[in-house]
């Protein structure tokens, strides 16, 4: 039995910071879990990961290239990424694994979320000299 996950298909970011919510068809408070966020079509890079259960709030840790934190309630894990750059634009996949108690459960691969980080253009206004 695979768990289903819902993600927003697209997030356009112009503030260098984004919150991505992963909504699961399973009660997160029922078991001990490992929630992670992966970057890339083949989920090559583990961006952020947190372990949690019903008795403690998870500690999220990030890949060296990213800054992340997270939070969860009974059906949603929310990853917050900041200091994002244009080259972080990519598709991101939510993953969850329920380890304890058995049986092991994980989610069906979702369609992912394209996070598009907009380039910041600095506007230099031509100032007229005072007469």
């Amino acid at each position: 039995n695979k768990i289903l996950v819902k993600q927003s298909p697209l997030l356009v970011v112009d503030s260098n910071e984004v919150s991505l919510s992963c909504r699961y068809s399973y009660n997160l408070l029922a078991k001990e879990f490992r929630a992670s966020l992966y970057k890339g079509v083949n989920s090559d890079v583990e961006v952020c990961v947190g372990n949690g259960n019903f008795t403690y709030q998870p500690q999220f840790r990030s890949n060296a290239e990213f800054n992340c934190d997270g939070d969860f309630d009974n059906e949603t894990v929310t990853f917050r990424l900041w200091n994002l750059h244009v080259n972080h634009t990519d598709i991101y996949f939510c993953k969850i694994e329920f380890m304890y108690p058995p049986p092991y459960l994980d989610n069906e691969r979702s369609n992912g979320t394209i996070i598009h980080i907009k380039e910041k253009h600095l506007c230099h206004t031509q100032s007229s000299p005072k007469l």
Partner: antibody
Framework: EVQLVESGGGLVQPGGSLRLSCAAS??????????VSWIRQAPGKGLEWIGE???????YYSPSLKSRVTISRDNSKNTLYLQLNSLRAEDTAVYYC????????????WGQGTLVTVSS | DIQLTQSPSSLSASVGDRVTITCRAS??????????LHWYQQKPGKAPKLLIY???SLQSGVPSRFSGSGSGTDFTLTISSLQPEDFATYYC?????????FGQGTKVEIK
């Protein structure tokens, strides 16, 4: 037929590191449904769980060893590894790898074990 | 961590005897009606061998003289009629929570 074969044991200096291998056959380490744990047994003592790796590559470790241990695998060789650092005399033990299925997490297949002796 | 306490630590018995070993967990190891408590047999110089899984299910190939019972925190391994090959050390193990833990073992010796 499922088989697990450990190797890499021997005499190690205190403060040194060990890297043990567990070659699996009869099942794939990267296919869903099974994971593998490392378990050790000091001479004349009971069994101590070290940690585990799931088919996904996710790992869990014993809190008492977490800072010194890494479990990894090479899917192309269907082999599991245990790296243990900063070795001390009390790490002297027979090290086993054992497979578990995802329904109950009982250890249904075990390797023969490999002895690691930490001594100067 | 969940502590598992086995009793007795050792026992002497004769061939044909009925032997009972108990395992007590520091908290319940039940989830959705399943007890995540398993029993292993270990002979000197050998790896442990799974006997009973999920408290009462007999592992394939294990003789029917071995049985397990219990739920929650109290579990029992019974050997109905001890055979010469049964002299060994027996361990219980829980997989309800990480870290997985084992009992300290019960050594069954010849009287």
């Amino acid at each position: 037929e499922v088989q697990l074969v450990e190797s890499g044991g021997g005499l190690v200096q205190p403060g040194g590191s060990l890297r043990l291998s567990c070659a699996a056959s009869g099942f794939s380490l990267s296919t869903g449904g099974v994971g593998v744990s490392w378990i050790r047994q000091a001479p004349g003592k009971g069994l101590e769980w070290i940690g585990e790796i799931y088919h996904s590559g996710s790992t869990y470790y014993s809190p008492s060893l977490k800072s010194r241990v890494t479990i990894s695998r090479d899917n192309s060789k269907n082999t599991l590894y245990l790296q243990l650092n900063s070795l001390r005399a009390e790490d002297t033990a027979v090290y086993y790898c054992a497979r578990y299925e995802y329904d109950y997490y009982d250890f249904d297949y075990w390797g023969q074990g490999t002895l690691v002796t930490v001594s100067s | 961590d969940i502590q598992l306490t086995q009793s007795p630590s050792s026992l002497s018995a004769s061939v044909g005897d009925r032997v009972t070993i108990t395992c007590r967990a520091s908290q319940s190891v039940d989830f959705h009606g399943i007890s995540f408590l398993h029993w292993y047999q270990q002979k000197p110089g050998k790896a442990p061998k799974l006997l009973i899984y999920a408290a009462s299910s007999l592992q394939s190939g294990v003789p029917s003289r071995f049985s397990g019972s219990g739920s929650g925190t109290d579990f029992t391994l019974t050997i109905s009629s001890l055979q010469p090959e049964d002299f060994a050390t027996y361990y219980c193990q829980q997989s309800y929570r990480s870290p997985r833990t084992f009992g300290q073992g019960t050594k069954v010796e010849i009287k």
